[in-house]
Amino acid sequence: MAVTACQGLGFVVSLIGIAGIIAATCMDQWSTQDLYNNPVTAVFNYQGLWRSCVRESSGFTECRGYFTLLGLPAMLQAVRALMIVGIVLGAIGLLVSIFALKCIRIGSMEDSAKANMTLTSGIMFIVSGLCAIAGVSVFANMLVTNFWMSTANMYTGMGGMVQTVQTRYTFGAALFVGWVAGGLTLIGGVMMCIACRGLAPEETNYKAVSYHASGHSVAYKPGGFKASTGFGSNTKNKKIYDGGARTEDEVQSYPSKHDYV
């Protein structure tokens, strides 16, 4: 029951996370015009991964796509790539995890197959979340660098008379959506991996043992795992004295660190 709940929750959390990553990738507000300590303008600028927008005070909004590939900064291209990789991996992970769900019965799929699929989707979710977090963090770092560069020469006097105001950009809503979504996908992936451990059938090393009852000579053999229905816990075939002890080699380890570029 706990395994099913963990797997189900992991799936839902990952689903929300991937939806968030898709939303963040599509959003226009990755960077927004910094209004703090800035002359008040009747125009508000904001930029996304795919286009930049200008909203006038009247409400009129005009967006222009980045119709060039080669002319775009390498960092922006890298962020785009990371977000797309995150979405693709997440989508594949979702597809795999649907079939891996313990509550869904597909043919005569064994628990071992479901465990492997759960682990695969979990790893995919973890990598997807890391891609999103890395992409958003790279963009945020780029913004911070540009912000302080533009602050250094915000007002450049021209002949002491005319002033040109440089538009500074700060974190947009999409960054926060991306960070949260990436985190959720990561958490969902970890939950799937934890659920995988509970799903995985453990090989019994019992040999066939003959039990002699008085008056009868019947041999009982422990049944194989193939008898499992896929629903509930098959107590007949489980080792009773496990104690949770595992060797270090048995414990699956996953990458938990990532670099903020």
Epitope: A42, N45, Q47, S52, S58, E62, V162, T164
Partner: antibody, heavy 118, light 113 residues
Framework: QVQLVESGGGVVQPGRSLRLSCAAS????????VHWVRQAPGKGLEWVAV???????NYNSALMSRFTISRDNSKNTLYLQMNSLRAEDTAVYYC????????????WGQGTMVTVSS | DVVMTQSPLSLPVTLGQPASISCKSS????????????LTWFQQRPGQSPRRLIY???TGESGVPDRFSGSGSGTDFTLKISRVEAEDVGVYYC?????????FGGGTKVEIK
């Protein structure tokens, strides 16, 4: 047909208050912003204030402490409350619709004359 | 506040001849986001309310004769009348539509010689 009709102007003593009205027709105040602009006799145009479709306001910093822009959406009417009036506030006051493009002013009223005199 | 400086103050022109009005702003009116200049030109005929001729520095208002054209970018702008007609007599104003408070130029009076 977009139309703006100002009213409420007249002769007022210095230090007194006056409220100007601007009745808008042909468009909604919740869709378009409206500006107040004034013109002293024989002088140029001076921007006073604006209330945008969303309700946010901006003022000429020199007049902000004395003038307040507001609107009544149900009546589709704009107001300019002018307090502590001075002789230099004598002018024709125009209300003008904020254009959807370019932040300009595309339709203007005929104006109402405000004379501040003792 | 952004200061808008218009020149000349008065412009006597011959009918059918071109006319040019200059407007300079103390800060750039060019928005980097859309590369548009937030400068508006108005015409005020004697005894009338102003009317918008040009917005975004060079986009003509619908219904405005195409003899009126706007140009310039950043801080220097120009309004040109290709062939002045009698109905063009009046005062022309440029307006900063980028920074609050919106400010107008002092005006240029166009009159027939």
């Amino acid at each position: 047909q977009v139309q703006l009709v100002e009213s409420g102007g007249g002769v007022v003593q210095p230090g007194r208050s006056l409220r100007l009205s601007c009745a808008a027709s042909g468009f909604s105040l919740t869709t378009y912003g409206v500006h107040w602009v004034r013109q002293a006799p024989g002088k140029g145009l001076e921007w006073v204030a604006v209330i945008w479709a969303g309700g946010s306001t901006n003022y000429n910093s020199a007049l902000m402490s004395r003038f307040t822009i507001s609107r009544d959406n149900s009546k589709n009417t704009l107001y300019l409350q002018m307090n502590s009036l001075r002789a230099e506030d004598t002018a024709v006051y125009y209300c003008a619709r904020a254009a959807y493009y370019g932040n300009g002013l595309d339709y203007w009223g005929q104006g109402t004359m405000v004379t501040v005199s003792s | 506040d952004v200061v808008m400086t218009q020149s000349p103050l008065s412009l006597p022109v011959t009918l059918g001849q071109p006319a040019s009005i200059s407007c300079k702003s103390s800060q750039t009116l060019l928005n980097s986001g859309n590369q548009k200049n937030y400068l508006t030109w108005f015409q005020q005929r004697p005894g009338q309310s102003p009317r918008r001729l040009i917005y975004w520095a060079s986009t003509g208002e619908s219904g405005v004769p195409d003899r009126f054209s706007g140009s310039g970018s950043g801080t220097d702008f120009t309004l040109k009348i290709s062939r002045v007609e009698a109905e063009d007599v009046g005062v022309y104003y440029c307006q900063n539509a980028y920074f609050y408070p919106f400010t107008f130029g002092g005006g240029t009076k166009v009159e027939i010689k």
